[in-house]
């Protein structure tokens, strides 16, 4: 199900992207699911739709609920759901778990903390950064574009980091804050030639025509924080974005999952409404880092309907 969880604080701006992707030329209609009421597109409204984006300027607790977005193309419609929760501002310093974005890990060499969701907003530098509610001061902290860099990271740098910025919409300014935890790893990491865990080499994946199918490309690259590690899908040797088939999209799974101490990445290829021509393509799962690139190829085959006997 194409559903995405989004959250924000009352009296702050919140912008939500439709979980279903489409070309910029496609129209996107937004509805409040509980009432099936259409969200207006006029910018004079506090809550309005702007293409793939749903904007709460500013958000109110009463805005919480499920919103439906329908991406309309000349040949198909795709539906997504945004589960939005707006919370009251906390009077004390503690940021509750439900307001936290994904934890990031850093090490002495790599200590970038990205400000979550900032790419959805119309903001201008500099960002303000806080750690455990205290404004960060000192030459060790550098706000650079949409991330914070900490020089000479120490274990004491672990904690909750909040970025604060101003979103500008038609001359009006709205505040936005986002918090995530930062952990410091002191163990020595290492990097290996990529190892693809899934799919198996030359795997044949059975699919049903007209149904949706998912392929997961999963690879591990070593231990600890990895530099320039990536997994991606290609169709017949072409990037997904260049292939030009909107039914086929890739989206990141878990970013860096440190299961068994290994640094791994996932990329999910989603094929909507599988067609006969999809069976003719070569689906390449590519995993690459500084050492090199490994490729596993998948082909699709038609699943034969099984007779169900009692």
């Amino acid at each position: 199900k194409f559903s995405k969880q989004s959250w924000g604080l009352e009296n702050e701006a919140l912008i939500v992207r439709c979980p279903r992707q489409g070309k910029p030329s496609y129209t996107v209609d937004w509805y409040y699911s509980q009432t099936n009421k259409s969200i207006p597109t006029q910018e004079r409204n506090r809550v309005f739709a702007s293409g793939q984006l749903l904007k709460f300027l500013p958000a109110a607790v009463a805005d919480s609920g499920i919103y439906t977005c329908i991406v309309r193309s000349p040949t198909f419609n795709r539906t997504g759901y945004a589960n939005v929760t707006i919370y009251k501002k906390q009077s004390d310093c503690n940021v509750p778990d439900y307001l936290m974005y994904s934890t990031v890990s850093g090490s002495e060499k790599n200590s970038k903390i990205y400000c979550p969701t900032i790419d959805l907003y119309n903001w201008t530098a500099p960002l303000e950064w806080f750690k455990n509610c205290q404004a960060l001061q000192g030459s060790r902290y550098r706000a650079h574009k949409s991330f914070l860099v900490i020089d000479n990271v120490m274990t004491e740098d672990a904690g909750d980091y909040t970025c604060k910025f101003i979103h500008n919409e038609n001359g009006a300014n709205y505040s936005v804050t986002a918090t995530r935890s930062f952990t410091v790893k002191d163990e020595q990491g290492f990097s290996l030639f990529p190892v693809i865990g899934a799919p198996a080499q030359n795997e044949i994946k059975e699919v049903e025509i007209g149904k949706n199918a998912n392929l997961t490309c999963s690879a591990c690259f070593g231990k600890g924080t990895q530099f320039l590690a990536a997994v991606l899908w290609q169709l017949n040797g072409t990037k997904i974005t260049d292939f030009g088939e909107p039914r086929i999209q890739q989206e990141e799974g878990q970013n860096q999952s440190f299961s068994n101490g290994l640094a791994c990445l996932d990329m999910v290829l989603r094929i909507a409404d599988v067609k006969e021509e999809d069976l003719l393509l070569q689906y390449d799962c590519l995993a690459l880092n500084l050492h090199g690139l490994r490729r596993h190829t998948v082909r699709l085959s038609r699943k034969n309907p099984i007779d169900h006997h009692s």
């Epitope: 030639f193 080499q201 290609q234 017949n236 040797g237 072409t238 990037k239 070569q282 390449d284 590519l286 690459l288 050492h291 090199g292 690139l293 490994r294 490729r295 596993h296 190829t297």
Partner: nanobody, 118 residues
Framework: ESGGGSVQAGGSLRLSCATS????????MGWFRQAPGKEREGVAA????????FYADSVKGRFTISQDNAKNTLYLQMNTLKPEDTGIYYC????????????????WGQGTQVTVSS
């Protein structure tokens, strides 16, 4: 291959390799070199679908591998050359499902001599 020759340390050379007959999609292509009395050494590689590039540590920051699909040509731009870069440079293709500077290639060219004097 072409573009080899003699050059002083610190100089530059650009090697070219005509790759007609090689399927350009989903292919690993690269350069390796062999110095007299030494083992073959991988230099650089490129995965043609996406242009992902990989280099041996000894040449990182000095050498650049690139491709021109329209001309079916593979290049190796070599800057800040050192005497230890001396050897015969081979253009190579088809490394199966892996691509790196140390890939084992299934086909390669005749080679071009590069000599760097101090």
């Amino acid at each position: 291959e072409s573009g080899g020759g003699s050059v002083q340390a610190g100089g530059s050379l650009r090697l070219s390799c005509a790759t007609s007959g090689v399927t350009y999609r989903r292919t690993c292509m690269g350069w390796f070199r062999q110095a007299p009395g030494k083992e073959r050494e991988g230099v650089a590689a490129i995965y043609t679908s996406g242009g992902f590039t990989f280099y041996a540590d000894s040449v990182k920051g000095r050498f650049t591998i690139s491709q021109d699909n329209a001309k079916n040509t593979l290049y190796l731009q070599m800057n800040t050359l050192k005497p230890e870069d001396t050897g015969i440079y081979y253009c190579a293709a088809e490394a199966g499902d892996e691509c790196s500077a140390s890939s084992v290639f299934r086909s390669w060219g005749q080679g071009t001599q590069v000599t760097v004097s101090s």
